[in-house]
């Protein structure tokens, strides 16, 4: 007998994971066999759609590989022409294991700023997100919070926040872990110990000490009066993100020494500076202070200038007079900037005889200053241009005046050979006579302040300059 369709197994809610199979069963009893149609959200499912499978004369609808978009209400309708059509509906809930769609990435952040490590997730039910730091679950506090999005926000990042992080997304279907990422906390360069200012005697050794920290560990550079330090030895050590730099100086002039700690944050740099002044206590000139002794010159710098086996005055106000005076000559030459081939040997002779003065042995060893005339010859003939440049620097305050006097004698204060020929020393290497005058460049200074005498010819007519040292 004909029988109207009856749905014996109403549709139920089906939970399915993405990419899984999902089947709705709509068991129907009727005679004759009914036509069964299916809808999703009231839209007819086409039976030739290859994403679906129809079995048992339409009583089973299978979605062969579930997608997110398959979520919705599915209805089966059975009709065999006897009585009315019957319908049953059920929901497909597309469940999804947690998936991290935007995982965290390595972050470098400067201490004190805000860091956000992303962790965006998908899943149904909505996954809960937690974070692991190192091997332990991360505890939230007033600075550290897991946002609604799953991202980790750290306010006022501290050094101890650095480490390895991963986010964990969890729902009833499973757990997803992000890869481990690194949070690196960078810290601006900071000086922990600034160099101290010193007031020292001329020729002293001074060690300036500068300690800095930062992440990455900063580099330390030293600046002397605005320029990179040219002399002195630097020793550095690094321990526990602290760099310790020691600059050892032989003091021949006052100066402002600056310690600069620098580290790099991406394309930017952070620097910290600290400065110390080195001043020189009033220094009694050697000729007025006879504390010293006579000794043969054993250095290198003035070898070519001083007479062989010459007795020179070594000033005991220095801890190591020989070394101190040798270094002083070297330093003095470096003070002279543009030095012409004419000036160089003359200046070399003047400086060597000024710093390593001839020594008169006796009960009280006495230094013999250079004769004024020889000094003026160097100043106003051989080195006229250079002398002017140096005097200009002195006036502009680039040299302290006493420092300038240490490098180059003040000719006017030296004894004249006319007063007492034994009271001052000649410069035998200045092979000069009036016939040579035409070889010198025209005078740039005004008329010499004193008559420059006919300086006696010396047996040596050539100037030898040690290549190890230059006057530039």
């Amino acid at each position: 007998l004909p029988k109207a369709p009856v749905i014996t197994t109403p549709l139920e809610t089906v939970d399915a994971l993405v990419e899984e199979v999902a089947t709705f069963m709509c068991a129907v009893e009727s005679y004759p066999q009914p036509e069964i149609s299916w809808t999703r959200n009231k839209i007819l499912i086409k039976l030739f759609d290859t994403r679906y499978s129809i079995r048992e004369n339409g009583q089973l609808l299978t979605i062969l590989s579930v997608e997110d978009s398959d979520d919705g209400i599915y209805c089966c309708t059975a009709n065999n022409g006897v009585g009315g059509a019957v319908e049953s509906c059920g929901a497909l809930q597309v469940k999804m294991k947690p998936k991290i769609t935007r995982p965290p990435i390595n972050v470098k952040i400067i201490e004190g700023l805000k860091a956000v490590l992303p962790c965006t997730t998908m899943g149904n039910p909505k996954p809960s997100v937690s974070w692991i730091k190192g091997d332990s679950p991360l505890r939230e506090n007033s600075r550290i919070a897991v946002l609604e999005s799953g991202s980790l926000r750290i306010h006022n990042v501290q050094k101890e926040d650095a480490g390895q992080y991963r986010c964990v997304a969890k729902n009833s279907l499973g757990t997803a872990y992000s890869k481990v990422v690194k949070l690196e906390v960078e810290v601006f360069a900071r000086i922990l110990r600034a160099p101290e200012s010193h007031n020292v005697t001329f020729g002293s050794f001074v060690t300036l000490h500068c300690t800095a920290t930062g992440i990455p560990v900063p580099t330390i550079t030293w600046i002397e009066n605005g320029n990179a330090v040219s002399s002195g030895s630097i020793q550095e050590s690094v321990k526990d993100r602290v760099i310790d730099s020691r600059l050892q100086l032989f003091i021949t002039k006052p100066g402002l020494y600056t310690c600069i700690a620098t580290n790099k944050h991406g394309e930017k740099f952070s620097t910290a500076k600290a400065a110390a002044t080195i001043s020189i206590a009033e220094w009694s000139k050697p000729q007025k202070d006879n504390k010293g002794y006579c000794a043969q010159y054993r250095g290198e710098v003035c070898n070519a200038v001083l007479a062989k086996d010459a007795l020179v005055f070594l000033n005991t106000s220095y801890a190591d007079p020989e070394e101190a005076q040798e270094l002083l000559v070297h330093t003095a030459w470096n003070e002279l900037k543009v030095v012409s081939p004419v000036c160089r040997p003359a200046a070399e002779a003047l400086l060597c005889n000024h710093i390593f003065q001839e020594c008169s042995p006796g009960v009280v060893p006495t230094p013999i200053p250079i004769c004024r005339e020889y000094c003026l010859a160097v100043k106003e003939l051989f080195c006229a241009k250079e002398w002017l440049v140096m005097e200009e620097k002195t006036h502009r305050g680039l040299y302290r005046s006493e420092m300038h006097l240490l490098s180059v004698p003040e000719c006017s204060k030296l004894p004249s050979m006319h007063w007492d020929p034994t009271a001052c020393a000649r410069l035998p290497h200045l092979d000069y006579n009036k016939e040579n005058l035409k070889t010198f460049p025209p005078m740039t200074s005004s008329k010499p302040s004193v008559d420059i005498p006919n300086l006696p010819s010396s047996s040596s007519s050539s100037f030898s300059v040690s290549p190890t040292y230059s006057m530039t």
Epitope: A16, M25, A27
Partner: antibody, heavy 121, light 107 residues
Amino acid sequence: EVQLVESGGGLVKPGESLRLSCAASGFNFSTYTMHWVRQAPGKGLEWVSSISSRSAYKYYADSVKGRFTISRDIAKNSLYLQMNSLRAEDTAVYYCARDFFQLGPPRFDSWGQGTLVTVSS
Amino acid sequence: DIQMTQSPSSLSASIGDRVTISCRASQRISSFLNWYQQKPGKPPNLLIYGASNLQSGVPSRFSGSGSGTDFTLTITSLQPEDYAIYYCQQSYSPMYTFGQGTSLEIK
């Protein structure tokens, strides 16, 4: 009484073809989905293919897709499996089975005795 | 495709023993799960359908349970004729798949 009888098995060389038949009786053949299931010597059961009552839907296991074709003849109450490009691994006893769907999910409530297919050179 | 995994692969038991065989699906299959018994040289025989329904003519010592992904076949008091290979099968997907089988032997 439901009866399913397979035939057409035998020895063939690799690459050759064979057609299996299953004669159905004792039930309304036109209203049931039918299946082929095979069992390699000493191995488990492997579903091979199915065909819906009106031949509208046909399904195949990945291992035979493109080589085997399922069909049915309602007038003759027969189910067929055309097997082409046979391989050594197709060697098995082939069963035809009726799919019963009532008061529960589909299940194979009736089976034939099977026919042996041997693929060997 | 949905994979079906049975455990154990084989087991020895004595007459009168209670025996359980497990079957796990690779995804949720509701209760679209059937159990078959096969004796040497014979076709399989349907025991349980829809996870827990006893096929007519099958002794009541056989029972099935489970839903979703985990299913169990239980034989309460093993009889000599029960020594056979048991297969689970899913019919949730149109690509029907069987478990690898569990061989039940006499101890």
